[in-house]
């Protein structure tokens, strides 16, 4: 099994009320095959944002075209941001398995969201 | 209903080439990856090609590469298979095939038979 | 290369199970595609290891390990005689790849 590291490069990304924010996320290699799929928070509450292979997230677009083969790049976009979407987000590798099972996760990336400029 | 309706197969001699076309209905098109796959008489399926959802990244089996362009047309919902210097070896049920996330297949068409002959 | 049996006979109602090796387990994912009768469409019964498509009946089931994928067909029925393909996808080639196929006849 290779060794892979999920990188999410931005500790922290505001944005203002409304507006989209881009969470950044890559992989550094595609083995072994499983899923990305993104949460909010940690531990068995956490909220999941994103998956890549299931589920309706029509707020949630892969930045990068995920139907390429060679594609490492696991970056979302959500859109019309409130605040209630505050809160740090993990991009999370999946080995693929009955279930999948959790390999790595990000650091995080702590998203804060500033009042709509008037 | 997912529908996949290959066309443009026929008798062609050696060395001729040809066009195959791939029309897509029940889904967004532009969505998923698509593959072309074919069945030579009395054989299995063999892998061709395939072609990401937006049509950026290409991928072929080695025996094809050179001769078969895999393309695709989003605003018309089809996919195609430029096909050249064509050989006995290539008489086959053509098949489009429709990707998962993962880029097995779901969903296939009927298929159109080529028949390179002198 | 995917390896699978030529052919496999079993009783209506009997199990029979179908393996499929020679993918990598960390990078390969595999499906299960049928075909009842050379040159028609096949049909997808199993992606993804073990993924059934919600219009292919409960008695169909799939599950990977190690180096092999097997589909079950728990209380087989005389329509699924049929060829049974076994499709691989290498996360590590961007290649897809298929087994020579399995006869399966229901006696």
């Known amino acids: 099994e290779e060794e892979l590291q999920v990188i999410q490069p931005e500790k922290s990304v505001s944005v203002a009320a409304g507006e989209s924010a881009t969470l950044n996320c890559t992989a550094t290699s595609l083995i072994p095959v499983g899923p990305i799929q993104w949460f909010r928070g940690v531990g068995p509450g956490r909220e999941l944002i994103y998956h890549q292979k299931e589920g309706h997230f029509p707020r949630v677009t892969p930045v990068s075209d995920p139907t390429k083969r060679n594609n490492m790049d696991f970056s979302i976009r959500i859109s019309n941001i409130t605040p209630a979407d505050a809160g740090t987000y993990y991009c999370v590798k999946f080995r693929k398995g009955s279930p999948d099972v959790e390999l790595k996760s990000g650091a995080g990336t702590e998203l804060s969201v500033r009042a709509k400029p008037s | 209903d997912v529908q996949l309706v290959e066309s443009g197969g026929g008798v062609v001699r050696p060395g001729e080439s040809l066009r195959l076309s791939c029309a897509a209905s029940?889904?967004?098109?532009?969505?998923?990856?698509m593959s072309w796959v074919r069945q030579a008489p009395g054989k299995g399926l063999e892998w061709l090609a395939g072609i990401s959802a937006g049509g950026s990244d290409t991928y072929y089996i080695d025996s094809v590469k050179g001769r078969f362009t895999i393309s695709r047309d989003n605003p018309k919902n089809s996919l195609y298979l430029q096909m050249s210097s064509l050989t006995a070896e290539d008489t086959a049920v053509y098949y489009c095939?429709?990707?998962?996330?993962?880029?097995?297949?779901?969903?296939w068409g009927l298929g159109t038979l080529v028949t390179v002959s002198s | 290369a995917l390896t699978q049996p030529a052919s496999v006979s079993a009783n209506p109602g009997e199990t029979v199970k179908i393996t499929c090796s020679g993918g990598?387990?960390?990078?390969?994912?595999y499906a299960w595609y049928q075909q009842k009768s050379p040159g028609s469409a096949p049909v997808t019964v199993i992606h993804s290891d073990d993924k059934r498509p919600s219009d292919i009946p409960s008695r169909f089931s799939g599950s990977a390990s190690g180096s092999a994928a097997t589909l079950i067909i728990t209380g087989v029925r005389v329509e699924d005689e049929a060829v049974y393909y076994c499709g691989g996808y290498d996360g590590r080639t961007y290649i897809n790849t298929f087994g020579a196929g399995t006869t399966l006849t229901v006696l």
């Open positions: 095939a429709r990707e998962t996330w993962n880029h097995l297949f779901d969903y």
């Open positions: 990598d387990y960390y990078s390969t994912y």
């Open positions: 029940g889904f967004t098109f532009s969505s998923y990856a």
